[in-house]
Interface confidence: medium
């Protein structure tokens, strides 16, 4: 018998369903147990920019420690404000700095991602280490990446359509699921049904779906049934703020008594069949009907309470952004550029508009130095000699002051330029890990210790080692020591920085060939990066040091195969 119930989209104020899933449009998970670097690749597609994204990395400790470094490659198609959480994880992040803006300083090593197509990005990532996971996500709001979790049977990660990332990756789409509703014809009363249908996924085993149900009505006002239908391997953990009738497939339990499993029923696996089930249970209204991919957490917010159902003519749109300006986010968008003895601040109007901010003024600390409106952006420029610039031996500092229409206080942000003329970079070679006695001689088979310094020191910037190699001339070739801020090979170790923040590493040099070169050049590329703010202020320098090489040792790591 056909059930007459014309499912129509329900307005977001009547019902909204958000969910977290490990199903991705394309993806792969592979095992790389012996890799020094755990590589993860995320391809993120956003239908409209700019978007906000919360990205959390979680480490599962092995033997009480987190042994491996992690490279996360982030490929995005439009502007993203990224809120990154990766506490205690030795993370290297490769991304496009013109598209990704951090809400707060990432506090991790970063590398510019070349503008390659997807296949080449995967190849580029694979050159750095075996890929543990890769996924393509459409309009994510938040992503949780669990490290050290890869359960894949593959030893090589190749993107395949409609994949389940298991425990490795869970994500929440920005667009809530389409919620539909209808009146069940010929049924009297006010009983409402909430139907959730979880579609089969590529699951490798039993799954528990947590269903959070929040109905905003007084407890006495509600007569409702919750119908949960899914594949046989799914059980349900229900967290509801109201008592209601429960009708599920598989088994279910309640969050308040998680150990008490209750057997469910055999339910039809078609929308028509589920509507029939709701009718059989005496529901007069289907307040929400939702079909979802296999999810780990589903949240249903509804406010129908058995009242008159309101449907909306159009499908539910993405949750609208706040129409209140976030000054903190706004200030993070100010880009600082330093060139030709001048500081330039740039604020793109497109991003400002997205944050619903109305700017009434952008100045330096000296309010007479005002930004000019250049159509698509505000530009504020001043020579180092004016507008209240504070010039020190290593740095030029000022303050960006932004007046926002809705805020009674101007927003302030410290801005800095490096005084490159006064900065000097030095490479130091030491024979012991105490870094006390400098030397210019290395001995094959003996560990050498290297430290890079900048003077005078610059507290607002971070000094980082991007790459180092040892050039041993035509005889000895080149030994790569550090690449992409990671140690190359077993004979190189990145060490903790000095108390002043100077980067340090050690290396061990061996030769299999003769003649052994008598001299070499140690060459390191270093970067000064702002501890807060944008990557556009990065300064790169290459520093050289001539070394003498003494007494051979014919075992161990080699400079040339």
């Amino acid at each position: 018998e056909t059930v007459h119930c014309d499912l129509q989209p329900v307005g977001p104020e009547r019902g909204e369903v958000t969910y977290t899933t490990s199903q991705v449009s394309k993806g792969c998970v592979a095992q790389a147990p012996n890799a020094i670097l755990e590589v993860h690749v995320l391809f993120l597609e956003f239908p409209t920019g700019p978007s906000q994204l919360e990205l959390t990395l979680q480490a599962s400790k092995q033997n009480g420690t987190w042994p491996r470094e992690v490279l996360l490659v982030l490929s995005v198609n439009s502007s993203v404000f990224l809120h990154l959480q990766a506490l205690g994880i030795p993370l290297h992040l490769a991304y496009n700095s013109s598209l990704v803006t951090f809400q707060e300083p990432p506090g991790v090593n970063t590398t510019e991602l070349p503008s390659f197509p997807k296949t080449q990005i995967l190849e580029w990532a694979a050159e750095r280490g075996p890929i543990t996971s890769a996924a393509e996500l459409n309009d994510p709001q938040s992503i949780l990446l669990r490290l050290g979790q890869a359960q894949g049977s593959l030893s090589f990660c190749m993107l395949e359509a409609s994949q389940d990332m298991g425990r490795t990756l869970e994500w929440r789409p920005r667009t809530p699921a389409l919620v539909r509703g209808c009146h069940l014809e010929g049924v009297a009363g006010h009983k409402e049904a909430h139907i959730l249908r979880v579609l089969p996924g590529h699951s490798a085993g039993p799954r528990t779906v947590t269903v959070k149900v929040e109905l905003s009505c007084a407890p006495g006002d509600l007569d409702a049934v919750l119908i949960l239908q899914g594949p046989p391997y799914v059980s349900w953990l229900i967290d509801a703020n109201h008592n209601m009738q429960i009708w599920t497939t598989g088994e279910y339990s309640f969050k308040i008594f998680p150990e008490k499993n209750i057997r469910g029923f055999k339910l039809p696996d078609t929308p028509q069949g589920l509507l029939g089930e709701a009718r059989m249970l005496n529901a007069s209204i289907v307040a929400s009907f939702v079909e979802l991919p296999l999810a780990s957490i589903v949240s249903l917010h509804a406010s129908s309470c058995g009242g008159r159902l309101q449907t909306s003519p159009a499908p539910i749109q993405t949750t609208p952004p706040k129409d209140t300006c976030s000054p903190e986010l706004l200030m993070s968008l100010i880009q600082t550029k330093c060139a030709d003895d001048a500081m330039t601040l740039v604020l793109k109007k497109e991003l400002v508009a997205h944050l619903k901010c109305t700017i009434t003024g952008l100045t330096f600390w000296d309010p007479s130095c005002e930004a000019e409106d250049r159509g698509d952006k505000f530009v504020l420029r001043s020579a180092y000699s004016s507008c209240g610039m504070q010039v020190s031996a290593s740095m030029i500092s000022n303050e960006a002051v932004v007046n926002i229409l809705s805020s009674s206080s101007p927003q302030r942000k410290k801005v800095h330029c490096l005084n490159m003329d006064s900065l000097s970079f030095q490479l130091g070679l030491y024979l012991s890990p105490h870094f006390l006695q400098a030397s210019n001689t290395i001995e094959p088979g003996q560990q050498s210790f290297v430290q890079v310094r900048v003077s005078p020191s610059v507290s607002e910037f971070l000094l980082q080692l991007d790459s180092c190699h040892l050039d041993l001339g035509p005889e000895g070739g080149t030994v790569e020591l550090i690449q992409g801020r990671a140690a190359k090979g077993n004979c190189v170790s990145l060490l903790s920085p000095s108390p002043e923040g100077d980067p340090r590493f050690s290396f061990l040099l061996h030769f299999y060939t003769v003649p052994i070169p008598k001299t070499g050049t140690l060459s390191c590329t270093v970067a000064l990066r702002p501890k807060t703010g944008s990557q556009d202020q990065e300064v790169h320098r290459t520093v050289f040091m001539r070394l003498n090489i003494i007494s051979p040792d014919l075992s161990g790591c080699t400079s040339k195969g």
Epitope: D323, T324, C325, P327, S406, S407, S408, S409, P410
Partner: antibody, heavy 116, light 108 residues
């Protein structure tokens, strides 16, 4: 450190006036918008008024509009609330509050009692 | 002008999770801010812009906002968290500030 010290509270008869002051220190007073917020005994917080950092804009809750005036003297680092035509329902602890995007900083408050 | 509604009281045992809600028609579009006020003391900000935590506030305090409801969550509530908690929001269209009625959190 940031300090906001309210003064001028006390007992006053209905219909009379009172002027509250708030002395600010530990920050650049002229860079911040300031609010007055009150809390009647045993009740929740109620926003009263706001003044822009430079005094250019002032806004009031409907319950005090036309009776209360917020002002500031940036040279003296002081915020004021002139309260006229006081009513019994104006009895409350009045807090002076510094505005900023990442939240407000509150003084300890001064008690105003309107009673005959 | 709109209103913000909070439950008058919430009780939890030490170590449990406390959730305090604040509902208002404007919250899908406005940020929620949360204050803690201990007896006889001035209020202290614990969450701003829905979910951001000021420095110095313990990590057990978190905030979220979905639809017309903002929620302050205290994971593993402690006896010292016993206080009144108020939400507020700024109606920037009229430059008014709206407070919720406050919720008394009891940690038994």
């Amino acid at each position: 450190q940031v300090q906001l010290v309210e003064s001028g509270g006390g007992v006053v008869q209905p219909g009379r006036s009172l002027r509250l002051s708030c002395a600010a220190s530990g920050f650049t007073f002229s860079s911040y918008g300031m609010h007055w917020v009150r809390q009647a005994p045993g009740k929740g917080l109620e926003w009263v008024a706001v003044i822009w950092y430079d005094g250019s804009n002032k806004y009031y809750a409907d319950s005090v509009k036309g009776r209360f005036t917020i002002s500031r003297d940036n040279s003296k680092n002081t915020l004021y609330l002139q309260m006229n035509s006081l009513r019994a329902e104006d009895t409350a602890v009045y807090y002076c509050v510094r505005d900023y995007s990442s939240g407000w900083y509150w003084g300890q408050g001064t008690l105003v009692t309107v009673s005959s | 002008s709109y209103e913000l509604t909070q439950p008058p009281s919430v009780s939890v045992s030490p170590g449990q999770t406390a959730r305090i809600t604040c509902s208002g028609d404007a919250l899908p579009k406005k940020y929620a801010y949360w204050y803690q006020q201990k007896s006889g003391q001035a209020p202290v900000l614990v969450i701003y812009e829905d979910s951001k935590r000021p420095s110095g506030i313990p990590e057990r305090f978190s905030g979220s906002s979905s639809g017309t409801m903002a929620t302050l969550t205290i994971s593993g509530a402690q006896v010292e968290d016993e206080a009144d908690y108020s939400c507020y929001s700024i109606d920037s269209s009229v430059n008014h500030v709206v407070f919720g009625g406050g919720t008394k959190l009891t940690v038994l």
